[in-house]
Interface confidence: low
């Protein structure tokens, strides 16, 4: 029978008695930066070219005996997971291995940097098809290593890395913390995050998605036909590198941003048991397990969006947090979240010629997060329309007044420390869904976009009594671009998008009691692009 991990990443339409999805990534080259490998193993023989690159530190300990099979163990297994004949994800992908880890699995930042430079030069000398670089390693945070990954990513290379096996915030490690890298955590057959001894998979906002990473059967370096089970985020990253190779082989023109959005879109949603993660990390950690798309073609018509969380602002009174989209993505909305509920909202602002999402802490607050909704919207022209605090008691409102522009998101930002506690709720006048409404003491920001065939609509879900969480989801065929709470709810901690659902969180209802201000309304802006749909129909 198929190993559990291949079964898990395979959509039902490919399933038979064997794992045989179409096109095994044959147009893609995967670079593996790891230990040495046993290239004559029957799983990977003829599929992996061992480059002459080697940059590793000396092994520790005077009595360390170099045993070839142990030196090759990690890299051989990962090469097998990516492209192995029997147990590999992308059976058609060709690989090149660079040795940056020694026989004890240790490497250096400098060795990895030189390895990445080797790949960049190889790419310049002999350009091939799409490149995927697999970095199944993790060390302490390194600005210089993250910068090197950014350079390579901006040259069109897809980098996939392990989140790390430290049961910790992946943002504290490199290259996992590099925003341009696709960072992968590990789950097991029961969709529990993987435990490894007293530690386990890393988590948090720097993880893009999870993939199978426990008891993964793959090539063993003990003999040329041996197999072994290994566990860790390296194995998880190898699955995603294989899936990326499959996707890029089917659509070689995909950009990194498009590939990442597709990986997220086609993942299994909300299947991980989040109780394993520390409480403060649950909301930040994506509940996504990687899977191959049900069809390698025809996904181009969809409007893809993802949620990007900022780092925590810290608790100082004027602290802010900034969330950014990738260069090829459009910021379509901006929201904020504070566990204490003390925040001064958020706004979209220009920074370096690109819109960013900035959230503001309030006096006495423990800090805030900014949450950006980042979307792929070709030929888009987006701008932010702002209305300052209103004079009238009707509250502040702003709409998209330019011809052909549609509302994709609403933000509000205020200077007063305790907005809402002394003002009656402001209700949206019915029949005016394409505008943002806020408190009279808040400035309101509307994200307005023009793009061919883009249409959006507003969906609301209100609950009269206090609830810790109110959600509203977009229907099939529509994509969530904006998520906010209607004003008048002083106890709201914030709003954020989870996949296609807008979540508005409130304080524990036992502390707020049921008051006239208990009503909580979640507001979702759902969009679709008729232009993208038509374009893909023409292609097929």
């Amino acid at each position: 029978s198929i190993p559990w991990n291949l079964e898990r990443i395979t959509p039902p339409r490919y399933r038979a008695d064997e794992y045989q999805p179409p096109d095994g990534g044959s147009l893609v080259e995967v670079y593996l930066l790891d230990t040495s490998i046993q290239s004559d193993h029957r799983e990977i023989e003829g599929r992996v070219m061992v480059t002459d690159f080697e940059n590793v530190p000396e092994e520790d300990g005077t009595r360390f005996h170099r045993q070839a099979s142990k030196c090759d163990s990690h890299g051989t297994h990962l090469a097998g997971v990516v492209s192995g004949r029997d147990a590999g994800v992308a059976k058609g992908a060709s690989m090149r291995s660079l040795r940056v880890l020694n026989c004890q699995g240790k490497g250096t930042v400098s060795g990895t940097l030189i390895g990445l430079e080797f790949i960049r030069k190889s790419q310049l000398v002999q350009p091939v098809g799409p490149l995927v670089v697999l970095l199944p390693l993790a060390g302490g945070y390194s600005r210089v290593l993250n910068a090197a990954c950014q350079r390579l990513a901006r040259a069109g290379v897809v980098l996939v890395t392990a989140a790390g096996n430290f049961r910790d915030d992946a943002c504290l490690y490199s290259p996992a913390s590099a925003p341009e890298v696709i960072t992968v955590g590990a789950t097991n057959a029961q969709d529990q995050p993987v435990t490894l001894g007293t530690l386990g998979t890393n988590f948090g906002r720097c993880v893009d998605l999870f993939a199978p990473g426990e008891d993964i059967i793959g090539a063993s370096s003990d003999c040329s036909t041996c197999f072994v089970s290994q566990s860790g985020t390296s194995q998880a990253a190898a699955h995603v590198a294989g899936i990326a190779a499959m996707m890029l082989s089917a659509e070689p023109e995909l950009t990194l941003a498009e590939l990442r959005q597709r990986l997220i879109h086609f993942s299994a949603k909300d299947v991980i048991n989040e109780a394993w993660f520390p409480e403060d990390q649950r909301v930040l950690t994506p509940n996504l397990v990687a899977a191959l798309p049900p069809s390698t073609h025809g996904a181009g018509w969809q409007l893809f969006c993802r949620t990007v969380w900022s780092a925590h602002s810290g608790p100082t009174r004027m602290a802010t947090a900034v969330a950014r989209c990738a260069p090829d993505e459009e910021l379509l909305s901006c929201s904020s979240f504070s566990r204490s509920g003390k925040r001064r909202g958020e706004r979209m602002e220009a920074q370096g010629g690109k819109l960013v999402c900035r959230a503001h802490n309030a006096f006495g607050g423990e800090g805030v997060y900014a949450i950006a909704r980042c979307c792929l919207l070709p030929q888009a022209n987006c701008s932010v329309h702002t209305a300052p605090p209103a004079e009238a008691s009707m509250g502040t409102r702003v709409h998209c007044h330019q011809q052909g522009h549609v509302l994709t998101g609403c933000s509000s930002h205020w200077e007063v420390e305790d907005l809402g506690t002394h003002k009656p709720p402001v209700l949206r006048p019915r029949g005016q869904p394409n505008q943002c409404v806020g408190h009279r003491e808040a400035s309101i920001h509307a994200s307005c976009c023009h793009a061919p065939g883009l249409e959006c609509k507003v969906k609301e879900h209100g609950i009269p009594a206090p609830q810790e969480q109110v959600t509203v989801a977009c229907e099939e065929g529509w994509t969530l671009t904006g998520c906010s709470a209607l004003p008048g709810t002083s106890h709201v901690l914030g709003a954020y998008a989870v996949d296609n659902t807008c979540v508005v969180r409130s304080r524990d209802v036992s502390t707020t009691g049921s008051t006239s201000e208990g009503a909580v309304t979640a507001v979702a802006i759902c969009c679709r692009s008729r232009h993208l749909a038509q374009a893909s129909q023409e292609l097929q």
């Epitope: 399933r15 057959a189 029961q190 993987v194 426990e214 197999f227 566990s231 299994a268 397990v289």
Partner: antibody, heavy 118, light 113 residues
């Protein structure tokens, strides 16, 4: 031949200890999770514990948590169940079972009887 | 924990006739990511260990005669023996392997009428 050979059952007093063994052959032991399942006299099947192929992850039924320890020796291709603080309600036939790596059991041992009585 | 409830507790069927056993789980065992029901059926003959018959609710284990079939999805499942043979006299158990603790039904005893 693909098989699981069990040993280690017997009569033990309440509060006592016992270690069950299960020797695997005919398949790649390290690649599969393994389980213990028990069956009290005249009763149905009760899952006791599971251990992943690498040995890194274990799970226990609430009724045995803190008293039983599942382990495996990959070099000996053997699964173990160390049973401590035994109670009368632990009396059962104990089966070891190979896991398909999903949680269903595609190969079973013949079973070994554990009797807890004073 | 997921509770598994089988019905009937015992069943007497004539040779060559159809036997049907039902199994109900207290929550869905359909897994969204792969559209599979994490449910298996086992046969246990007197004095023997159980034997896996069906997994994924409807997939026969290799070597199992095709008179055994499984069906159902979500919380309601059925094991059918299309034409009962003398060697099919046994106790049959359903099991969920959606999550730990893995749980079995209480068993259904199948006899010949």
């Amino acid at each position: 031949e693909v098989q699981l050979v069990q040993s280690g059952g017997g009569l033990v007093q309440p509060g006592g200890s016992l270690r069950l063994s299960c020797a695997a052959s005919g398949f790649t032991f390290n690649n599969y999770a393994m389980n213990w399942v028990r069956q009290a006299p005249g009763k149905g099947l009760d899952w006791v514990s599971t251990i992943s192929g690498s040995g890194g992850t274990t799970n226990y039924a609430d009724s045995v948590k803190g008293r039983f320890i599942i382990s495996r020796d990959s070099s000996k291709h053997t699964l173990y169940l160390q049973m401590n603080s035994l109670r009368a309600e632990d009396t059962a036939v104990y089966y070891c079972a190979k896991d398909s790596n999903w949680g269903n059991f595609d190969l079973w041992g013949r079973g070994t009887t554990v009797t807890v009585s004073s | 924990d997921i509770q598994m409830t089988q019905s009937p507790d015992s069943l007497a069927v004539s040779l060559g006739e159809r036997a049907t056993i039902n199994c109900k789980s207290s929550q869905s065992v359909l897994y969204r990511s792969n559209n599979r029901n994490f449910l298996g059926w086992y046969q246990q003959k007197p004095g023997q260990p159980p034997n896996l018959l069906i997994y994924w609710a409807s997939t026969r284990e290799s070597g199992v005669p095709d008179r055994f079939s499984g069906s159902g999805s979500g919380t309601d499942f059925t094991l059918t023996i299309s034409s009962l043979q003398a060697e099919d006299v046994a106790v049959y158990y359903c099991q969920q392997y959606y999550t730990t603790p893995y749980t079995f039904g209480q068993g259904t005893k199948v006899e010949i009428k």
